[in-house]
């Protein structure tokens, strides 16, 4: 079974403290649901509410939980801690760094003459209804789960290339004399709560996670 990503590409640090706090509220609701008789959880799929029995134990396995997937009663606040989030930079830090150093928000990094090779945008997506699973099949994504009278939406933190026609533009700062380059959105698979017939089930679904530069050497013209 594939591993869920544990790290986010540099420059798109997910607000971990916020994520943990919201995840804690989900855990609390689940504990209450487990102690209640017949823990039936209503789930909303593609805008339609159906009473689907979701076993609270579905949420017990943390091993495959990705920081890019969040169950929350409220939209995640992207701009809450701007000094910690460090959304600006792409590729300026080690891939596996989990704690970013604080930077003064009044001195954004680009003032120091640092650029990302490819421009990208990141948002929490809370209205995903369908996705492609790891087998290439289209699946229905659970929009909401109602646990103990609290409605939790399923959010995905997605990163994509900002430039809609990246092949035309090339990557920033690449020597175009010797290299062909373009920016492209790359994907990863994350565990998400989906519908499997009439049951809710965890599946790996594909989401946009980074914008990277693709290089190929230009053919050398012989004299």
């Amino acid at each position: 079974e594939p591993h869920s990503e544990s790290n986010v590409p540099a420059g798109h640090t997910i607000p971990q403290a916020h994520w943990t706090k919201l995840q804690h509220s989900l855990d609390t609701a689940l504990r209450r649901a487990r102690s209640a008789p017949a823990a039936a959880i209503a789930a909303r799929v593609a805008g339609q509410t159906r009473n689907i029995t979701v076993d609270p134990r579905l949420f017990k396995k943390r091993r495959l939980r990705s920081p890019r997937v969040l169950f929350s009663t409220q939209p995640p606040r992207e701009a809450a801690d701007t000094q910690d989030l460090d959304f600006e930079v792409g590729g300026a830090a080690p891939f596996n760094r989990t704690h970013r150093s604080k930077r003064s928000s009044s001195h954004p990094i680009f003032h120091r003459g640092e650029f990302s090779v490819c421009d990208s945008v990141s948002v929490w997506v809370g209205d995903k209804t369908t996705a492609t699973d790891i087998k290439g099949k289209e699946v229905m994504v659970l929009g909401e789960v109602n646990i103990n009278n609290s409605v939790f939406k399923q959010y995905f933190f997605e990163t994509k290339c900002r430039d809609p026609n990246p092949v035309d533009s090339g990557c920033r700062g690449i020597d175009s004399k010797h290299w062909n380059s373009y920016c492209t959105t790359t994907h990863t698979f994350v565990k998400a709560l989906t519908m499997d017939g009439k049951q809710a089930a965890w599946r790996f679904i594909r989401i946009d996670t980074a914008c990277v530069c693709v290089l190929s050497r230009k053919a050398v013209r012989r004299a």
Partner: antibody
Framework: SVEESGGRLVTPGTPLTLTCTVS????????MGWVRQAPGKGLEYIGW?????TAYYASWAKGRFTISKTSTTVELKITSPTIEDTATYFC????????????WGQGTLVTVSS | AYDMTQTPASVSAAVGGTVTIKCQAS??????LAWYQQKPGQPPELLIY???TLASGVPSRFKGSGSGTQFTLTISGVECADAATYYC????????????FGGGTEVVVK
């Protein structure tokens, strides 16, 4: 710095090219945007040209405007001006992250009248 | 389209008072929002970017907040120099530029 030029009185249908001259800005690293403002009205995003040279336009501006650039200038061509194109045209540098316009020129006034 | 709707169109405030301007995006734009201040006969000037970060040299009485689709610009302790028109702008979607700027809010200081 950013400075626009080329604004003048033109008759409808006469093509006009506005020039944005930059200094201290590497156009191979920064994208540049064109914004206009009709007298007494709000700001209207016409389009932008990426550091790689690809131009993007608002849907209403497609076919009516052409954005191009050299190493030190960005040009906006109004292909067939109409009375509604009377406005002050601003050129501005777009930051490479978060995508806002941080350095603006003073603008150049285009008046279209018969 | 990622349409930006700004309210109110005009607001009046006394010196020392507080002004609140709202900007709504038709779709989720995360925190890719900027606020600009424009005085008559001048180009717009960047005030706030990334929804809440003050641009260099901007006084702390200006505050930006919000993310997703709802954003707010608050001016506390309004001064005469704050009389201007304020615009919000989405920086998330680079293909849909039709209403990238809000309609503007004129702030009149009494």
């Amino acid at each position: 710095s950013v400075e626009e030029s080329g604004g003048r009185l033109v008759t409808p249908g006469t093509p006009l090219t506005l020039t944005c001259t930059v200094s201290g800005i590497d156009l191979s690293m920064y994208s540049m945007g064109w914004v206009r403002q009709a007298p007494g009205k709000g700001l209207e995003y016409i389009g932008w040209i990426s550091y790689g040279g690809t131009a993007y336009y608002a849907s209403w501006a497609k076919g009516r405007f052409t954005i191009s650039k050299t190493s030190t200038t960005v040009e906006l061509k109004i292909t067939s001006p109409t009375i509604e194109d009377t406005a002050t045209y601003f050129c501005a540098r777009e930051t490479p992250v978060n995508y806002y316009l941080d350095i603006w020129g003073q603008g150049t006034l285009v008046t279209v009248s018969s | 389209a990622y349409d930006m709707t700004q309210t109110p169109a005009s607001v009046s405030a006394a010196v020392g008072g507080t002004v609140t301007i709202k900007c709504q995006a038709s779709e989720n734009i995360g925190s890719y929002l900027a606020w600009y201040q424009q005085k008559p006969g001048q180009p717009p000037e960047l005030l706030i970017y990334r929804a809440s970060t003050l641009a260099s040299g901007v006084p702390s009485r200006f505050k930006g907040s919000g993310s997703g689709t709802q954003f707010t610009l608050t001016i506390s302790g309004v001064e005469c120099a704050d009389a201007a028109t304020y615009y919000c702008q989405q920086g998330y979607n680079s293909e849909n530029l039709d209403n990238a700027f809000g309609g503007g809010t004129e702030v009149v200081v009494k």
